[in-house]
């Protein structure tokens, strides 16, 4: 906190301008007037105050506003917005898209902080659900926001949402997030037509069940390994050698360079070995002929 | 990628005015500040100011009202000016953007100016 | 305005040595200190900022410290590439300085 001095004669601001970058902390504190400020916060931004005016400023806007300051001023905080804290924000209630863009713009570069975790949580709550305007903003500064999220949280966004999500979007969702996401989607791109449908929905796929594989293995879709990969392996499991060979079409040569891995290698074990030789890839570790499979998982589920 | 690159005469005489312009390619000159920053030989660097891309600027009082920066938004280009130049004005004259308050992070190659007559 | 003093101004170091230069400040800046690397003719390249944070793409080998006054720059496992002038700057309050720089050479 700064001291309170008297403001030296003809210092006194009359104007928020670049003059003031060459005050001292103490004379910023005594020759500022906090409503000036406040009024005139647009041009805050358009200056390039050190972070320790910074702190000053926020100190006086702090005094003026202790229950929160209003969105007039939010919106212009710029650098300001960095010396916040959670608990800050908290006390805002910022409802303007165009606020969050204003204030993820400065932060822009850096990690997500705890400050912008605590806006984009408080601007969220306050708009009820996760709209696609707010998706497409949140996904343009943090790709990964969607997987940051919980699957509690995930179900509040709307299936037209799905339609803002990039593939990058997606990259660090783990099954769970996938689980809640793939239905959306599929409902989200319901109407359009088969190639298209596929390269939408690719991203969502390992959300998918096996009978929505198995839907897919029926429409020349030629599924890259990559995306196999990120199947949920107990929806690969009860494909057919021949489900997975029209699921992947060209690219299921790939199964020999991952059959060491999931789901590949437990998928690989629940295959009669000589469904798996007519692929002539060299697939071992299939089950052996003339051995009886049974589906312990069937029995338990009828006794 | 953001790109600076400084040019002007690398020789000045004494009492002239120093005149260089840096141009900027792989990214608008706004929404950004902009410094000139001059390093002369066997001295530490010197700070001489900053030029918004709306034109506003601020500069170090040790110039004396000598510099002044203009920018030319359509040329995406940020200009100096440094008049009654001295030999203490030979320097390695360097434009940057900044990035957070009082940081530097993108510097265009730099300029060598000698003030000879 | 605040006067940025290095210490060494010049060093001699070998390859895979561990070295430390010192950046003091004449006033208290908090942590508000960058560290640059300059090699001839070339722009000085941003390593450090707020004291002790590695810019994007700076390799770990590189570490800052201090708070206040006295600060220091550590390089550790000193390859050909490191070897180069180092220059500290402080912004906490204008006119932003720079300290006069570190030359550090091959022994």
């Known amino acids: 906190e700064v001291e309170k001095t008297a403001c030296p004669s003809g210092k006194k601001a009359r104007e928020i301008d670049e003059s003031l970058i060459f005050y001292k902390k103490w004379e910023l504190e005594a020759c500022v007037d906090a409503a000036l400020l406040a009024t005139q916060m647009d041009r805050v931004n358009a200056i390039p105050f050190t972070y320790e005016q910074l702190d000053v400023l926020k100190h006086k806007l702090d005094e003026l506003y202790p229950q929160g300051y209003p969105e007039s001023v939010i919106q212009h905080l710029g650098y300001l917005f960095l010396k916040m804290s959670p608990e800050d924000i908290r006390k805002w209630n910022v409802t303007s898209l165009e606020t969050l863009k204003a204030l993820l713009e400065v932060n822009k570069g850096h990690e997500m902080s705890p400050q912008v975790a605590t806006l984009i949580d408080r601007f969220v709550k306050g708009r009820g659900q996760l709209d696609k305007d707010t998706l497409d903003t949140l996904t343009a500064f943090y790709p990964g926001y969607l997987c940051s999220l919980s699957p509690e949280e995930l179900s509040s966004v709307p299936p037209s949402s799905i339609w803002a999500v990039r593939p990058q979007d997606l990259d660090t969702c783990d099954p769970r997030q996938l689980d809640v996401l793939y239905p959306k989607a599929r409902l989200a791109f319901q109407n359009m037509n088969g190639s298209e449908y596929f390269v939408k929905i690719q991203s969502f796929l390992g959300g998918a069940p096996t009978e929505d594989l198995k839907a897919l293995s029926q429409q020349n879709v030629s599924m890259d390994l990559a995306t196999f990969m990120k199947l949920r392996t107990d929806a690969v499991l009860p494909l057919t050698v021949a489900e997975v060979q029209k699921l992947l079409g060209p690219h299921v040569e790939g199964l020999k360079a991952e059959e060491r891995h999931r789901p590949v290698r437990d998928w690989i074990l629940r295959q009669r070995q000589d469904d798996l030789d007519t692929l002539g890839l060299g697939l071992q570790g299939g089950i052996p002929n003339g051995y009886l499979v049974l589906d312990l998982s069937m029995q338990e589920a009828l006794s | 990628q953001l790109q600076l690159q400084e040019s002007g005469p690398g020789l000045v005489k004494p009492s002239e005015t120093l005149s260089l312009t840096c141009a900027v390619s792989g990214g608008s000159i706004s929404p950004y500040y902009w410094t000139w920053i001059r390093q002369s030989p066997g001295k530490a660097m010197e700070w001489m100011g900053y030029?918004?891309?709306?034109?506003?600027?601020n500069y170090n009082p040790s110039l004396e009202s000598r510099a002044t920066f203009s920018v030319d938004t359509s040329k995406n280009q940020i200009s100096l000016k440094l008049n009654s130049v001295t030999a203490a004005d030979t320097a390695v004259y360097y434009c940057?953007?900044?990035?957070?308050?009082?940081?530097?992070?993108?510097w265009g190659p730099g300029t060598l100016v000698t003030v000879s007559s | 305005d605040i006067v940025m003093t290095q210490t060494p101004s010049s060093l001699s170091a070998s390859v895979g040595d561990r070295v430390t230069i010192t950046c003091r400040a004449s006033q208290g800046i908090s942590n508000y200190l960058a560290w640059f690397q300059q090699k001839p003719g070339k722009a000085p390249k941003p390593l450090i900022y707020?004291?002790?944070s590695l810019q994007s793409g700076v390799p770990s080998k590189f570490s800052g410290s201090g708070s206040g006054t006295d600060f220091t720059l550590t390089i550790s496992n000193l390859q050909p590439e490191d070897f180069a002038t180092y220059i500290c700057q402080q912004y906490s309050s204008y006119p932003i300085t720079f300290g006069q720089g570190t030359r550090l050479e091959i022994k």
């Open positions: 940057t953007k900044v990035g957070d308050p009082g940081l530097f992070d993108y």
């Open positions: 030029i918004h891309y709306s034109g506003r600027t």
């Open positions: 707020a004291a002790s």
